[in-house]
Interface confidence: low
Amino acid sequence: ENLTVTEAGWDGLRLNWTADDLAYEYFVIQVQEANNVETAHNFTVPGNLRAADIPGLKVATSYRVSIYGVARGYRTPVLSAETSTGTTPNLGEVTVAEVGWDALTLNWTAPEGAYKNFFIQVLEADTTQTVQNLTVPGGLRSVDLPGLKAATRYYITLRGVTQDFGTAPLSVEVLTEDLPQLGGLSVTEVSWDGLTLNWTTDDLAYKHFVVQVQEANNVEAAQNLTVPGSLRAVDIPGLKADTPYRVSIYGVIQGYRTPMLSTDVSTAREPEIGNLNVSDVTPKSFNLSWTATDGIFDMFTIEIIDSNRLLQTAEHNISGAERTAHISGLPPSTDFIVYLSGIAPSIRTKTISTTATTEALPLLENLTISDTNPYGFTVSWTASENAFDSFLVTVVDSGKLLDPQEFTLSGTQRKLELRGLITGIGYEVLVSGFTQGHQTKPLRAETITEAEPEVDNLLVSDATPDGFRLSWTADEGIFDSFVIRIRDTKKQSEPQEISLPSPERTRDITGLREATEYEIELYGISRGRRSQPVSAIATTAMGSPKEIMFSDITENAATVSWRAPTAQVESFRITYVPMTGGAPSMVTVDGTDTETRLVKLTPGVEYRVSVIAMKGFEESDPVSGTLITALDG
């Protein structure tokens, strides 16, 4: 019906034709040089074909192409067409780079823009079998050719193709690299439940490795582990102890599996523990020691159970590196069973056991409190000889308002005198002993300090010019002594301090200044401590005038003189009365005077004359004397 030539290249043609839908048995195609120089080519093709590539023609040559179909022995009319092949453009050189075991890179040179595309054919040299045909765009000058066989010689042919023709082929021969393979398979760090597998490879980018682990006797199914292609070692845990294994590995790279490498290895024996021993037993502790396979255990579990099952079970987890343990905080005189097991990542060993009995605690007893007084008391106790390193005495007030006081004493002491406590409050005393670092249960006692002894009712009486009498009250049998402190209120003289034995409750104080105000303080002393003081104010009496003398005596007058007391007075009163009886007479003079004239006396009479000093309402004792007036005459 219609015959066309498309894609006429420099050495071939592509034919397309149309035909009705008769069941053609075949088509016959004839190709002949237009000048009939060469014999025509006759081709037979299947009847369902409607296109055909015709290669192997001459460059720049005119051709006549004819076709007819055959159906049920009938030949259709011939269809013909004329066409020419093109001239060959120049290809440059073709080279091969980056030759691998399954690929290479093809490079070539060619004029820019000359070719619509390039046609590349890859043949195996030994079989001359075409393994790849590919067409690439005309702008390319390089192409990767993957999917090749390792260690194989190839012929690679390159043609440039334009709109009308293809170039003469350029060829190159190349040998691919050998296959990648693993090497140096070894097993390191073999433990009882695992191992580390190491291998070496050529320097290629493996996708992954497949590791196969199987018991040598094939009892269990093999484990297949896939590991990343970047690794050259892998841990394989979860194996059985003391078991032979075959470990195999292959690499996968671009869909290719390397040959498998294998090695045989046996896991180590299962880890063990043993020789559990008890040592260094004390009332509250003991030490444990044991043996164990090194480098295996993460942890040991120690369980401590008292034989009577009265105490809560104690469990201790300790590092797998340890081979000893110190067990403390136990009660004395108690039987224990000790269980030990070792724990590794996927195993707990069978439990081993031993027994231990804590020692009895030395005795500490009979806590006694004696010599209680307002400021303290004595604590005493009994204890086993040479059993204790030290004692701890703790004293705390019953109200728990104050910080506890703690006293650490040597193990030889059995008594502690406590001083400096607060009077009249309750105290709790705890005594415990220390032996080999362990503390006994404390003994406990309570007591109350006595009330503070008091002095009271300080009274002043019988004031004299140089003193006065003091009296006071105090609790009986408490005080060792009393102290009286006296000082004039104006602080013109040094204070006096008088110490008295305890039975006394009065004291005459002398040697003071007359008419002087004194402050008095009295306190008791008990066991070296002072009671609260009591105070009073007292004033000494005025001093009396002294050394009365008479002079210038006449029948009806006389002069009386005296020495004034030390302290200033307001006045002096002079009283004179006949010895034989009669009304007394009085004269008052200024306190600065020390003499006065007595007048209107009776001649030849004996008079008693008294002088007193006065200040306010206070009067001094008198100074007295007698005089006899002269007779008339």
């Epitope: 760090e189 695992g194 580390t196 590791v211 484990q223 582990l225 896939t226 590991v227 990343p228 690794l231 070692a233 892998v234 841990d235 394989i236 845990p237 979860g238 993460d298 942890m299 579990t301 987890n317 724990i343 590794a344 990542p345 996927s346």
Partner: nanobody
Framework: QVQLQESGGGLVQAGGSLRLSCVAS???????????LGWFRQAPGKEREFVGA????????YNPDSSKGRFTISRDNAKNTVYLQMNMLKAEDTAVYYC???????????WGQGTQVTVSS
């Protein structure tokens, strides 16, 4: 008993990365380094699939069908934590990711609650 808690999941664009963490606690006195740990995933309507694992001493293994060279597992014993680094994520990586104790597909006794990873295309 051991508790495992995963974190780090979430929504990520295709081609992106995520780092999942799994913290172990309550190891009953055992050190964390005593455990192998594995990562698994379960896509909707599919069976749980093994992604990879890390052994006690830090060796790692992977499922090539799920990881395709894009996933990396690591651990930090000091922090009791195992990690799953996922690069070049694809929509088919969408799943709930779980961590489990004892690795290498052998006896995974303890499992976390899982963390959802969603890869949008």
């Amino acid at each position: 008993q051991v508790q495992l808690q995963e974190s780090g999941g979430g929504l990520v664009q295709a081609g992106g990365s995520l780092r999942l963490s799994c913290v172990a606690s309550g190891t009953s006195g055992l050190t964390f380094r005593s455990f192998g740990l594995g990562w698994f995933r379960q896509a909707p309507g599919k069976e749980r699939e093994f992604v990879g694992a890390i052994s006690m001493t830090g060796g790692t293994i992977y499922n090539p069908d799920s990881s395709k060279g894009r996933f990396t597992i690591s651990r930090d014993n000091a922090k009791n934590t195992v990690y799953l680094q996922m690069n070049m994520l694809k929509a088919e990586d969408t799943a709930v990711y779980y961590c489990a104790v004892n690795g290498l597909g052998l006896n995974y006794d303890y499992w976390g609650q899982g963390t959802q990873v969603t890869v949008s295309s």
